[in-house]
Interface confidence: medium
Amino acid sequence: MMTGTIETTGNISAEKGGSIILQCHLSSTTAQVTQVNWAQQDQLLAICNADLGWHISPSFKDRVAPGPGLGLTLQSLTVNDTGEYFCIYHTYPDGTYTGRIFLEVLESSVAEHGARFQIP
């Protein structure tokens, strides 16, 4: 039975040209996290394997930095980066947990962070 929950940074906004940290946290489970995959829509951004470390997908290698922790830092943001991002936690023995973050990249200098929320 999957008892865990994923807490994410929720709906967030950031300025064009700036950076943003995408962060998820898995709680309420003793399952072992074997790997975390980060994806934008249907495209893989990065993999963090518990044993083997980080690998960044080629189309993002110049603008994505691993961490902090199991999170991901997006740099040199453009308006095209606006959209849904997913953290996919592969765990044993529970299985897969997925968290969703919506990022809006703004032209203006006013960018406010949304509230954190949970996905059961």
Partner: antibody, heavy 119, light 107 residues
Framework: EVQLQQSGPELVKPGASVKISCKTS????????MHWVKQSHGKNLEWIGG????????SYNQKFKGRATLTVDKSSSTAYMELRSLTSDDSAVYYC????????????WGQGTSVTVSS | DIVMTQSHKFMSTSVGDRVNITCKAS??????VAWYQQKPGQSPKLLIY???YRYTGVPDRFTGSGSGTDFTFTISSVQAEDLAVYHC?????????FGGGTKLEIK
């Protein structure tokens, strides 16, 4: 030039063990993970596991866990795979393979080591 | 484990033809698929990674496409030297798994 040089062919008896080496050159050994792949009958490829030479972290295919052990010698930039309790099903060609830093596609492969298990 | 299925074990084609080799994942693997070419007696060689990225030095007649569960490897104009076995691999989640291989035969 990146090179992965594997040890020579092995003929071993059932129940025995085999240890294959993969000597690397042309890149910084600790910056890339190293993986081992089995190929039976010249066709099917099976991932055995991988090792992070930097910290010794290993990830194994459950099918081989307990029988395969991956190790490295950082001083000689060499990776090793030991396979124990061999049976005829383990007769195959074994490759070491190095992925790029951006994902786990294997861009460099050793020449392969043929292992024959026979009494 | 994710099962990668290459439905055609053999494909027969002629020089100059266009050929598509397909690979289906048992569950979604995003764009984390690689394609390898293996000639007789040789080690596999990486052609395509992350579904559609051509590896350094690979001729542009080789392309890859797909996302999720369905992937295609295409040779736009087959050459005699393309006689080989082609393998797909998912590098989305461990254990990394390979398809059964498709042997391309030249008529």
């Amino acid at each position: 030039e990146v090179q992965l040089q594997q040890s020579g062919p092995e003929l071993v008896k059932p129940g025995a063990s085999v240890k294959i080496s993969c000597k690397t050159s042309g890149y910084t050994f600790t910056e890339y993970t190293m993986h081992w792949v089995k190929q039976s009958h010249g066709k099917n490829l099976e991932w055995i596991g991988g090792i992070n030479p930097n910290n010794g972290g290993t990830s194994y295919n459950q099918k081989f866990k307990g029988r395969a052990t991956l190790t490295v010698d950082k001083s000689s930039s060499t990776a090793y795979m030991e396979l124990r309790s061999l049976t005829s099903d383990d007769s195959a060609v074994y490759y070491c393979a190095r992925p790029g830093w951006y994902n786990y596609a294997m861009d460099y492969w050793g020449q392969g080591t043929s292992v024959t298990v026979s009494s | 484990d994710i099962v990668m299925t290459q439905s055609h074990k053999f494909m027969s084609t002629s020089v100059g033809d266009r050929v598509n080799i397909t690979c289906k994942a048992s569950q979604g693997v995003s764009t984390a698929v690689a394609w390898y070419q293996q000639k007789p007696g040789q080690s596999p060689k990486l052609l395509i990674y992350s579904a559609s990225y051509r590896y350094t030095g690979v001729p542009d007649r080789f392309t890859g496409s797909g996302s999720g569960t369905d992937f295609t490897f295409t040779i736009s104009s087959v050459q005699a030297e393309d006689l080989a076995v082609y393998h797909c691999q998912q590098h989305y989640i461990t254990p990394w798994t390979f398809g059964g291989g498709t042997k391309l035969e030249i008529k």
